[in-house]
């Protein structure tokens, strides 16, 4: 919406634009208006940008008015929250940034017979971007001075210079994001993609063999395993082998066979030859022992002098036999030499998946964390290890435990701090996540838990000399009483600075006003009106541009007055035979210098830019994608690095192209699945996925690969009459009219007779960008003065 707030009004004499008083007549003594004050209200008209503002024509962006808000002079800067002095013009279109604003102060007549009268009017053409900040404007010429402020604000969830970028925070399966101050989506932790609905997998998760639907997860494809899905699953039953691809069984050194279960180095693996026997590999899982003297048997285990060498280990007793010797083993040992520990783990007595460790003449169970006891038959109390980090309590469950988390914590061990930041912080504040809470870090000028409160910078009463303090965002403004100025009202105002008196008059400063001592030929508050000397002093025609009149204001006693027939843009040059010519200022031509030269004649704007003629100047409004004084520079659409996932960006006109890598698709290489999403085609275009590319079907008025270039068709043929310039605006257009014309297609002749340019009851005749005064008897001159 466009907002305008009237701040102050100064109409010292209570006059109207036509010089009359708002109410009643003038005091004959001091020529000031007597009786009633003006009943001042304001009218506002907002329309398309005009280089030369015209008063008529429709208010295409909206219009409104205030009620009567004051008299001759008033100051509303202190009255915040008072909507009487505010006009709000909502708009349902993209804000075009450039605009023309007409503000008129009117006197309400308070009766049905008399029409309201205009006091003063201001016009302003410019450019304004949406912002919370106000822009102050002043009307400082004419009978009344007034000050007002304007701003454009976007509706909730709308951003950008045109208030046409939509972003509404969300946290559900469609997306998990907040919006930054420019309306860009900022993904919550753990999410990515243009809609923030693609989970960021566990760090290190194989992009080729793993995927996830939830943040921090890593789900393996068939044939892959491990925390990061980067380990292949070997062939089932593969014993001493590995894999590079799923289901392989590549044998380790010295192993063979389809499942790598055949020992090719039995001697090295088992060292079967005892008593210094030499081992030779004879085939897979086969060997032969060469025994030293005094030993025999397949493993050289038989000693001829049996018990002499203490063959029985582990406290076994030796007995010589006909075959050699026999060992009687101590408990827990077995084998011909008592060197084999009896496997007390067969059968396995460990419950609940416990691992059995064989001991000498016994066993030990290594239990999983949830179980304890000799055979892991008892439920372990996991709470003894204090696994719960930030919890009210730990509950022991059978083969498990449960942490009852303190507020703000989650996860099995209550060690994950819940993110409490969900867009509660206002006014662009940043949010810091705390435990079971959050803290808003406010920008300057704001306070409160959610930065919702504007700090009152007026609390310290900074304004001096009775100035009224007005609190604003991160600053204050002092509204000074009459006679004082300065940011703290610390300066005594000099009303003569800058000098308001015209035509060389002397200015005298007073307590709350000024006084101009006029030269003999001038009168009025500011000595701006030429006295009508012709009532008393005879005038002499010097030439067709000059008259002379008697004056005691010059040494020669004569004053020369120049004709203003050439208007404000030229000087009169006298010619013989009572004729004259006009010497025009730069940028103007015509008999009376009333025509603005068309500086766009040479077509200076390139690349489809539209030229708007000014006074001895021009301005180029560039087609989408171009910038510069002559629209000569192609805007680099790759500057924001729009291509994701290693895509290479190529700049086009008002567009870019991403050359995607590694199977990524879409306008910005952001998708694995589709070339299309809602942002691919602009301006209502429909996106079609064509496999390895996308295609946009554009609505009327748009063209280009992503419907990003406005067709000139809305300006062909030129709909603007009387030399108006057509500016393409999507499917529509805007006409920038030449001087003297107005309206949406420049078809209406501006009323050059408004407001009354002819004095002394002269009649005004309106032409095309000119007027003529037909004077009453006894009066002459271009304006009958």
């Amino acid at each position: 919406q466009f907002e305008l707030e009237i701040l102050s009004m100064q109409n010292v004499n209570g006059e109207l634009q036509n010089g009359n008083c708002c109410g009643g007549a003038r005091n004959p003594g001091d020529r000031k208006c007597t009786r009633d004050e003006c009943d001042t209200y304001f009218k506002v008209c907002l329309k398309e940008y005009q280089s030369r503002v015209t008063a008529g024509g429709p208010c295409s962006f909206g219009s409104g008015s205030t009620p009567v808000i004051g008299g001759n002079t008033f100051n509303l800067k202190a009255s915040r929250g008072n909507d009487r002095n505010r006009i709000v013009l909502p708009f349902s279109f993209a804000w075009p940034r450039s605009y023309t604003l007409l503000v008129e102060a009117w006197d309400s007549s308070n009766d049905t017979v008399q029409p309201d009268s205009i006091i003063e009017k201001a016009s302003h053409s410019g450019m304004i971007n949406p912002s919370r900040q106000w822009q102050t404007l002043k009307q400082n010429t004419g009978v009344a001075h007034f000050e007002y402020q304007i701003r454009v604000t976007c509706d909730d969830y709308y951003y950008g210079f045109g208030c046409n970028k939509f972003c509404r925070p969300r946290d559900d399966f469609f997306g998990h994001y907040a919006c930054d101050q420019n309306g860009n989506k900022t993904c919550m932790e753990g999410w990515m993609g243009p809609e923030c609905n693609r989970a960021i997998c566990r760090q290190g998760c194989s992009p080729k063999h793993g995927s996830c639907k939830l943040p921090g997860d890593c789900r393996c494809q068939y044939g892959w395993q491990g925390l990061y899905c980067d380990k292949c699953i070997p062939h089932p039953g593969c014993v001493h082998g590995i894999c590079n691809e799923p289901w392989q069984c590549l044998c380790e050194t010295n192993w063979g066979g389809q499942l790598c279960d055949k020992d090719l180095n039995y001697c090295g693996t088992h060292q079967p030859c005892l008593n210094g026997g030499t081992c030779s590999n004879t085939g897979p899982d086969k060997y032969q022992c060469s025994c030293p003297e005094g030993y025999s048997g397949p493993n050289c285990e038989i000693a001829e002098h049996a018990c002499l060498s203490d063959p029985c280990h582990n406290r076994g007793s030796c007995k010589e036999t006909s075959l050699g010797f026999e060992c009687e083993c101590s408990p827990g040992w077995t084998g011909p030499t008592c060197s084999t520990n009896i496997d007390d783990c067969s059968p396995n007595n460990c419950s609940h998946g416990g691992t059995c460790q064989d001991l000498v003449n016994g066993f030990k169970c290594v239990c999983p964390p949830q179980w304890t006891g000799k055979t892991c038959q008892l439920d372990a109390n996991e709470c003894e290890a204090k696994p719960c980090v930030n919890a009210k309590s730990c509950k022991n469950l059978i083969a498990s435990y449960y942490c009852d988390c303190l507020p703000g914590w989650m996860g099995q061990n209550c060690d994950i701090n819940i993110n409490d930041c969900l867009g509660q912080c206002q006014n662009d504040a940043s949010c810091r996540d705390l435990v079971n809470g959050y803290r808003c870090i406010c920008p300057p000028g704001y306070a409160g838990d959610h930065c919702e409160r504007d700090i009152d910078e007026c609390a310290s009463n900074p304004c001096l000399n009775g100035g009224h303090c007005q609190n604003e965002i991160n600053r204050f403004q002092c509204l000074c009483p009459t006679g004082f100025s300065g940011n703290l009202c610390q300066l005594d105002i000099d009303y003569c600075e800058p000098n308001p008196c015209q035509n060389g008059a002397q200015c005298y400063n007073r307590a709350s006003d000024y006084f101009c001592k006029c030269p003999e030929d001038y009168e009025g508050k500011n000595c701006s009106h030429l006295k009508d000397h012709c009532r008393t002093t005879p005038c002499e025609v010097i030439d067709s541009c000059t008259v002379a009149m008697a004056s005691n204001d010059t040494p020669e006693g004569v004053r020369y007055i120049s004709s203003n027939v050439c208007g404000p843009h030229g000087k009169c040059k006298s010619q013989s035979g009572g004729k004259f010519t006009c010497d025009c200022n730069k940028g103007f031509t015509g008999t009376y210098c009333h025509e603005n030269i068309n500086d766009c004649e040479s077509n200076p704007c390139r690349n489809g830019g539209t030229c708007i003629d000014g006074v001895n100047s021009y301005k180029c409004i560039c087609s989408d994608g171009w910038e510069g004084a002559y629209c000569e520079t192609n805007i680099n659409d790759c500057s924001q690095n729009p291509c994701h996932n290693g895509g290479t960006c190529r700049d086009l006109v008002n567009d870019f192209y991403c050359d995607c890598k590694n199977g990524w698709k879409g306008k910005t290489c952001h998708s694995r699945d589709s070339q299309c999403d809602e942002a691919t085609c602009n301006n209502g275009g429909t996106c079609y996925d064509e496999g390895d590319a996308f295609k946009c079907m554009c609505p009327g008025g748009w063209e280009g690969t992503t419907c990003n270039i406005a067709r000139n068709s809305s300006c062909l043929p030129n709909p603007c009459h009387n030399g108006g310039t057509c500016v393409v605006n999507g499917e529509s257009f805007t006409c920038v009219c030449k001087e003297g014309w107005e309206g949406p297609i420049c078809a209406q002749n501006t009323n050059d007779c408004s407001p009354h340019p002819c004095y002394n009851s002269g009649t005004c005749v309106d032409g095309d960008n000119w007027y003529r005064c037909e004077c009453a008897p006894g009066f002459a001159g271009p304006d009958c003065r």
């Epitope: 939509f166 559900d172 609905n197 921090g216 996860g411 809602e678």
Partner: antibody, heavy 119, light 107 residues
């Protein structure tokens, strides 16, 4: 008061088509995601499809993907479900439901419309 | 897809009893869990969203807790109008999935 009113249910033969509508009132329709949830006779709830507020994103259950299409007309405050190639197992009461932009819960439900697929 | 498992499938209780229903997710879903109540022939009604937030207009005897994979719906003092079927639902990622339901009957 928020109101969701489903219509368009009825008896249809296997392989046939139906179009369900859900008329919404009492809230700003264009600000909310909408969904269809169904319930076969004597069974639990099964999510069918969802569409976000602008109609840019849609999601479907695997069981209906390629056969059902969800859409919306924000100017008419209406949600639609176009059901093609209907099967006996699609027989259910179909509910439309609205979701606020945080947490994805279904905060308001319609009263449902019965779809029977039988020869 | 994320599986949601409710227990028990049904339970019998008396007016005034404290009733607890649990819901377990096959993967961690943070706090994206909602609870619904459904009476025969009626549409479901939202009770709890985001694991523990009470929907406006729902009596305070209903409460929710849990995060990650394990969640609980508690009715502190069962009232006659609370006899119904209760469903949990995850809403973090599509496809959205419901638990199979828990029927609360009069003992």
């Amino acid at each position: 008061e928020v109101q969701l009113l489903e219509s368009g249910g009825g008896l249809v033969q296997p392989g046939g088509s139906l179009r369900l509508s859900c008329a919404a009132s009492g809230f700003t329709f264009s600000s909310y995601a909408m969904s269809w949830v169904r319930q076969a006779p004597g069974k639990g709830l099964e999510w069918v499809s969802s569409i976000e507020q602008m109609g840019w994103q849609t999601y479907y259950a695997d069981s209906v993907k390629g056969r059902f299409t969800i859409s919306r007309d924000n100017s008419k405050n209406t949600l639609y479900l176009q059901m093609n190639s209907l099967r006996a197992e699609d027989t259910a009461v179909y509910y439309c439901a609205k979701s606020p932009p945080f947490y994805g819960q279904f905060d308001y439900w319609g009263q449902g419309t019965l779809v029977t697929v039988s020869s | 897809d994320i599986q949601m498992t409710q227990s028990p499938s049904s339970l019998s209780a008396s007016v005034g009893d404290r009733v607890t229903i649990t819901c377990r997710a096959s993967q961690s879903i943070s706090s994206y869990l909602n609870w619904y109540q459904q009476k025969p022939g009626k549409a479901p009604k939202l009770l709890i969203y985001a694991a523990s937030s009470l929907q406006s207009g729902v009596p305070s005897r209903f409460s929710g807790s849990g995060s990650g994979t394990d969640f609980t719906l508690t009715i502190s003092s069962l009232q006659p109008e609370d006899f119904a079927t209760y469903y949990c639902q995850q809403s973090v990622v599509a496809p959205l999935t419901f638990g199979q339901g828990t029927k609360v009957e009069i003992k």
